[in-house]
């Protein structure tokens, strides 16, 4: 199944003009994501059943080794490039989680809905970040890394990797919301 975010691998050829108050929109999207991140995390680990709800530190700690770094004290350009990488990583990871959860927890419709809503906001955020990078800094290409491929993992590993990613997401989105 296609991942929810396909990053643009392009020169600065923006099809539509950027929104007015682009940075305000980016801040608003980050605040929106930050406001719902904890609820998504709780919904996720609850849906996985035992042993997840009682072993959050062990199973859902934000131990994501290849997660793109973020430096809050950098220039706006540097922060936007790092934000772009993080959003691509989160988007592909969320796509994997959504695909896995539809198979592992087909009746957890509120979880599916929240995952899809989060992916939608991330898509919009990615578009806005790219617009800002292109229009102000003429950056049309950013090297990115993608979230781990969970397709060949067993049931427990799929659940655990998803939980760790959402734990990391909850943590990093708070940092990002503050940094912009």
């Amino acid at each position: 199944s296609p991942l929810p975010i396909t990053p643009v691998n392009a020169t600065c050829a923006i099809r539509h003009p950027c929104h007015n108050n682009l940075m305000n929109q980016i801040r608003s999207q980050l605040a929106q994501l930050n406001g719902s991140a904890n609820a998504l995390f709780i919904l996720y680990y609850t849906a996985q059943g035992e042993p997840f709800p009682n072993n959050l530190d062990k199973l859902c700690g934000p131990n994501v080794t290849d997660f793109p770094p973020f430096h809050a004290n950098g220039t706006e350009k540097a922060k936007l490039v790092e934000l772009y990488r993080i959003v691509v990583y989160l988007g592909t990871s969320l796509g994997n989680i959504t695909r896995d959860q539809k198979i592992l927890n087909p009746s957890a419709l509120s979880l599916h809905s929240k995952l899809n809503a989060t992916a939608d906001i991330l898509r919009g955020l990615l578009s806005n970040v790219l617009c800002r990078l292109c229009s102000k800094y003429h950056v049309g290409h950013v090297d990115v890394t993608y979230g781990p491929d969970t397709s060949g993992k067993d049931v427990f590993q799929k659940k655990k990797l998803g939980c760790q990613l959402l734990g990391k997401y909850k943590q990093i989105i708070a940092v990002l919301a503050q940094a912009f």
Partner: antibody, heavy 121, light 110 residues
Framework: QVQLQESGPGLVKPSDTLSLTCTVS?????????WSWIRQPPGKGLEWIGY?????????YYNPSLKSRVTISVDTSKNQFSLKLSSVTAADTAVYYC????????????WGQGTLVTVSS | DIQMTQSPSSLSASVGDRVTITCRAS??????LNWYQQKPGKAPKLLIY???SLQSGVPSRFSGSGSGTDFTLTISSLQPEDFATYYC????????????FGGGTKVEIK
């Protein structure tokens, strides 16, 4: 219909490497599937050896007690996957089954008929 | 490391009897427990998957129940063709797991 067929030598010398191949027919090997090897010593229960995922990640999981001696690989062009078990002893004498599991890979719904491998000099 | 323990290891029963086999996991496996039937010289055959779902073509006298750590396979009325060995298998975690199968239960004619 889908068929799995194990092939390989029925007799292997101690300390040698046991090599078996499973040929899958009537099935698109590129499909999201896990392929496993399972063995059964004479008169005993089933023992899971390991599996390989046929997909982008190519994940493999092995039984920890056999991990240092086991390699499972796949040849998608031939619709085959293989087992190699090194440094065999008489304790590795068993009927070896290949099996398949559909996403999310939690049960084995496809089985070969099994092949007996005897380790003896 | 999840260990699967099956009981009893063997039992004697008559045609028409109700037979119950249990399987216990050393830690929770949610509902990812499967049951197989094996006859001498044959490959195992999937009977029940994910604790309670009947595999296509399997008679309805076979049923499964349980979740978490404790699971049961029930044959409501034993038939002559049901004399075989039954195995449980956890499909939850293959990581660092020595064996995903239980030790087996041989159902013999009384």
């Amino acid at each position: 219909q889908v068929q799995l067929q194990e092939s390989g030598p029925g007799l292997v010398k101690p300390s040698d490497t046991l090599s078996l191949t499973c040929t899958v027919s009537g099935f698109s090997f590129s499909t999201d599937y896990w392929w496993s090897w399972i063995r059964q010593p004479p008169g005993k229960g089933l023992e899971w050896i390991g599996y390989i995922y046929v997909g982008t990640s190519g994940d493999t999981y092995y039984n920890p007690s056999l991990k240092s001696r086991v390699t499972i690989s796949v040849d998608t062009s031939k619709n085959q996957f293989s087992l190699k078990l090194s440094s065999v002893t008489a304790a590795d004498t068993a009927v070896y089954y290949c099996a398949g599991a559909d996403n999310p890979y939690d049960y084995f719904n496809l089985w070969g008929q099994g092949t007996l491998v005897t380790v003896s000099s | 490391d999840i260990q699967m323990t099956q009981s009893p290891s063997s039992l004697s029963a008559s045609v028409g009897d109700r037979v119950t086999i249990t399987c216990r996991a050393s830690e929770t496996i949610s509902g990812y427990l499967n049951w197989y039937q094996q006859k001498p010289g044959k490959a195992p055959k999937l009977l029940i998957y994910r604790a309670s779902s009947l595999q296509s073509g399997v008679p309805s006298r076979f049923s499964g129940s349980g979740s978490g750590t404790d699971f049961t396979l029930t044959i409501s009325s034993l038939q002559p063709e049901d004399f075989a060995t039954y195995y449980c298998q956890q499909g939850y975690s293959y990581s660092d797991t020595d064996n995903v199968f239980g030790g087996g239960t041989k159902v013999e004619i009384k």
